[in-house]
Amino acid sequence: AGIPEKAFNLTWISTDFKTILEWQPKPTNYTYTVQISDRSRNWKNKCFSTTDTECDLTDEIVKDVTWAYEAKVLSVPRRNSVHGDGDQLVIHGEEPPFTNAPKFLPYRDTNLGQPVIQQFEQDGRKLNVVVKDSLTLVRKNGTFLTLRQVFGKDLGYIITYRKGSSTGKKTNITNTNEFSIDVEEGVSYCFFVQAMIFSRKTNQNSPGSSTVCTEQWKSFLGE
């Protein structure tokens, strides 16, 4: 059967805690098993004996998003007898070839998803912009937590806006999901939002939201 090739280019793909480990190459005559370490430093088998080059590890990493997870991809000969004993994978008494993934700390390393402007609320000359607080797959007591519940005041939004007809832009930063500006009556305003994590040195900002204008919003609401 030949010696299985070690996996390479191990890469974490993660947005709002949905997390997949990807690697190369496509296997021939062997399979892959992924192992991930938990807080007790036990290795847990995932995607056991797969010919895929990806493994969804979301359900493991959401258990504690502040833990730095270690993972490895084992290359297992297809024709050998494999005994998966929970935290160990043994082939004829030998550990198969493996490659370690970079450590993954979800709180620090997951990308932020594209935010969505949920609604505008006008109160006289004040316009309140509300950014949707998306659900994540992180659970507490059986319920999914929102981004705000996970990140708290560490999560902020950069809100860039302009008058509908103007090219001049203004930018504000808020650490809540709402933002108010003074507006002129009868004038359309356009908004663009990015999420950010204040504590991060890298990978700090999300992609930008779609630009939404108050005129569009009125027509969307059928006003």
Partner: antibody, heavy 118, light 107 residues
Amino acid sequence: QVQLVQSGAEVKKPGSSVKVSCKAPRGTFSYYTISWVRQAPGQGLEWMGRIIPILGVANYAQKFQGRVTITADKSTSTAYMELSSLRSEDTAVYYCAREGDRRYFDYWGQGTLVTVSS
Amino acid sequence: AIQLTQSPSSLSASVGDRVTITCRASQDISSALAWYQQKPGKAPKLLIYDASILESGVPSRFSGSGSGTDFTLTISSLQPEDFATYYCQQFNSYPLTFGGGTKVEIK
């Protein structure tokens, strides 16, 4: 109970394209993998491809590579399957299905019948 | 791609009978196998996943067993509502594949 609601039946000419939609409840739609599975009349089930909306990751069965495109609109919690260069053998019921914790399908759409006929 | 071979392709049985359907994979898929029931004009319904775990709400007369390459779906006492087509599906690796189906008909 998660309900996946698909668009209505379509009749198409050979060589044309069809785009079928699958609307899911809001909430965690973006995180779940949505697959498309088809079933020709009197035949078995055939997996076409899948998408993970939040990651923008899509992949396809080799048989459909180059002819199928699966997309998702996170803002409306809707997944789409577009199949091009239609031929008569593409006449089938097309299902969207949500993959559970692993890759089995715990929820299915009601199915969309696509008829390809000249 | 991993091939799944279901047998028999059809069977006739009576209410109260014990029915067994087998599914064989072309390579080791560990326990990454699911079983579905499909009635005419309806979408498939998940019965069993991880080879032997009963989906919530599925009657306990359905059971699954096996690992590696050989799997079995058993209906311990066939009920009138169980007459349908049954499919196995592997989720060990993409592309996901289904067995050809087993039609359970009334004798």
